[in-house]
Interface confidence: medium
């Protein structure tokens, strides 16, 4: 048996292949600034709160700065997109290690968005979910590299199965890898293969480069392809690209708007 | 620095179930996974399992439908349950921390255990 | 599952000789996945290589790991008289070991 990229979904039992209506899927459209400036008083209110982020964000925040200091030893940094900040190399490399917040976070992105008041209250990855997100918009506006395909092996997740045509989402942030032998041996009981258009590659930000990393945010939407389940090895699922879809926008913005003066909340 | 130490009992009967506990002293138990690692005398390494501090558990296919394990974060400790145990399951059995880099970077000394009636 | 062999069983060799021992997988490894550990008698192993080339904190410039795919090598330039031990090469993707090889002195 083996793990997936970024221990992708281990530990994780069966789980419907559909669009994940319960994901907290934000784009942050329109209030990037409002969320930034929000963010040293949210992050240290989600430090209080949740000791595995706490933890990881500091072991990750160890990480960059060694690799600022000794680039030529890690492979030096890449040249970062405009708006790339210092927290956002951090947010990739603590979601790309090998500890618990990686699966403790996409655990409680899919859950996240079962209400606006589920995610205003008990959500405590609000920073990590903005930065992973706003990082992946900058790394793909950086690239301007279209659509591209990928590879995604996940152990311990079943999937019950979503027929050729049906429309998907993957529930949280998907690593994904652009070399196909990466994902099939780190994932034995499904192998995905994606035509991915909004995944950003992360490789120079990732706790291992070399796995050439693209990191899929939740809000893509894709159409099944294909399925199949053959009797030995892993569930073989191929997805395109279809567009994005999101329920949520700007939710904590709003709040924090709300609690200041008078506020209208719109249909989410 | 951060240490480990397995206790339980050296020998079990077979047909019983093994009970060891694995106490993480000189740091956090909260960001990373705990393994239980076996070896039989003179022969090589077997991984047992993983966990992580909300429970999530990954076992070895090969033992998982006899392998429990958990975590008690206020007591930094984590523990294993091994049933129906064989003398094919004597062994010394190791508790070691899954590091970031995705190995197991600290080890316990190691606890011998012995099945036999 | 990938199944890693390791050669030679025994190496039988002199102090301040060099070793060099082989991990094969059974199919491709991605290196990030490739540890060696280093295991005395009565002591629990100890990481040696991670990453298949990074050395471990601590763990002295005669050790050295190199491989991608499926042949990977650890190698001691000038072997001491505390490096007489077992080797075991390690990947995470199943957390498994291969059986490993014994350095002792001829």
């Known amino acids: 048996q083996s793990y997936s990229i970024s221990q992708l979904d281990i530990f994780s039992q069966e789980t419907p292949l559909d669009m994940a209506p319960a994901s907290f899927d934000d784009q942050y459209a329109g209030c990037l600034a409002d969320m930034t400036a929000a963010l040293p008083d949210l992050n240290h209110s989600e430090f209080q709160a949740n000791k595995v982020y706490a933890d990881g964000w500091a072991q990750a925040n160890n990480q960059w700065q060694e690799r600022r200091a000794w680039g030529s030893v890690w492979g030096s940094l890449p040249p970062s997109p405009p708006g790339f900040r210092d927290e956002h190399g951090v947010a990739l490399l603590a979601y790309t290690a090998n500890s618990p917040l990686h699966k403790e976070f996409n655990a409680a992105v899919r859950e996240a968005g079962r209400s606006r008041a589920h995610y205003l209250h008990h959500f405590s990855f609000k920073t990590l979910h903005f930065l992973l997100t706003e990082a992946l918009q900058l790394l793909r506006s950086h690239r301007s590299r279209g659509c591209q395909q990928v590879y995604r092996g996940v152990h311990g997740l079943r999937f019950r199965p979503a027929g050729p045509g049906a429309t998907v989402r993957l529930g949280g942030f998907a690593s994904a890898s652009l070399k196909n032998v990466a994902a099939q041996q780190f994932g034995e009981d499904t192998f995905f293969g994606i035509w991915t258009c909004l995944g950003a590659p992360i490789r120079g930000y990732s706790f291992f480069p070399e796995e050439e990393e693209v990191l899929i945010p939740p809000f893509e939407t894709f159409q099944v392809i294909n399925t199949s389940r053959p009797t030995q090895g892993p569930a073989r699922i191929y997805l395109r690209a279809l567009g994005k879809r999101s329920t949520y926008n700007c939710e904590y913005i709003k709040e924090k708007k709300c609690r200041s003066g008078p506020c209208w909340l719109g249909s989410s | 620095q951060v240490q480990l130490q397995e206790s339980g009992p050296g020998l079990v009967k077979p047909s019983e179930t093994l009970s060891l506990t694995c106490t993480v002293s000189?740091?956090?138990?909260?960001?990373?996974?705990w393994s239980w690692i076996r070896q039989p005398a003179g022969k090589g390494l077997e991984w047992i399992g993983r966990i992580s501090t909300s429970g999530f558990t990954n076992y070895n296919p090969s033992l998982k439908s006899r392998v429990t394990m958990s975590v008690d974060s206020s007591k930094n400790q984590f523990s294993l349950k091994l049933s129906s145990l064989t003398a094919a399951d004597t062994a010394v059995y190791y508790c070691a921390r899954d590091g970031w880099g995705r190995v197991f970077d600290i080890w316990g000394l190691g606890t011998m255990v012995t099945v036999s009636s | 599952e990938i199944v890693l062999t390791q050669s030679p069983g025994t190496l039988s060799l002199s102090p301040g000789e060099r070793a060099t021992l082989s991990c094969r997988a059974s199919q491709s490894v991605s290196s990030s996945y490739l540890a060696w550990y280093q295991q005395k008698p009565g002591q629990a192993p100890r990481l040696l290589i991670y990453?298949?080339?990074s050395r471990a904190t601590g763990i002295p410039d005669r050790f050295s790991g190199s491989g991608s795919g499926t042949d990977f090598t650890l190698t001691i330039s000038r072997l001491e008289p505390e490096d007489f031990a077992v080797y075991y090469c390690?990947?995470?993707?199943?957390?498994?070991f291969g059986p490993g090889t014994k350095v002792d002195i001829k």
């Open positions: 990453g298949a080339s």
């Open positions: 390690q990947q995470y993707g199943s957390s498994t």
């Open positions: 000189g740091g956090s138990i909260s960001s990373y996974y």
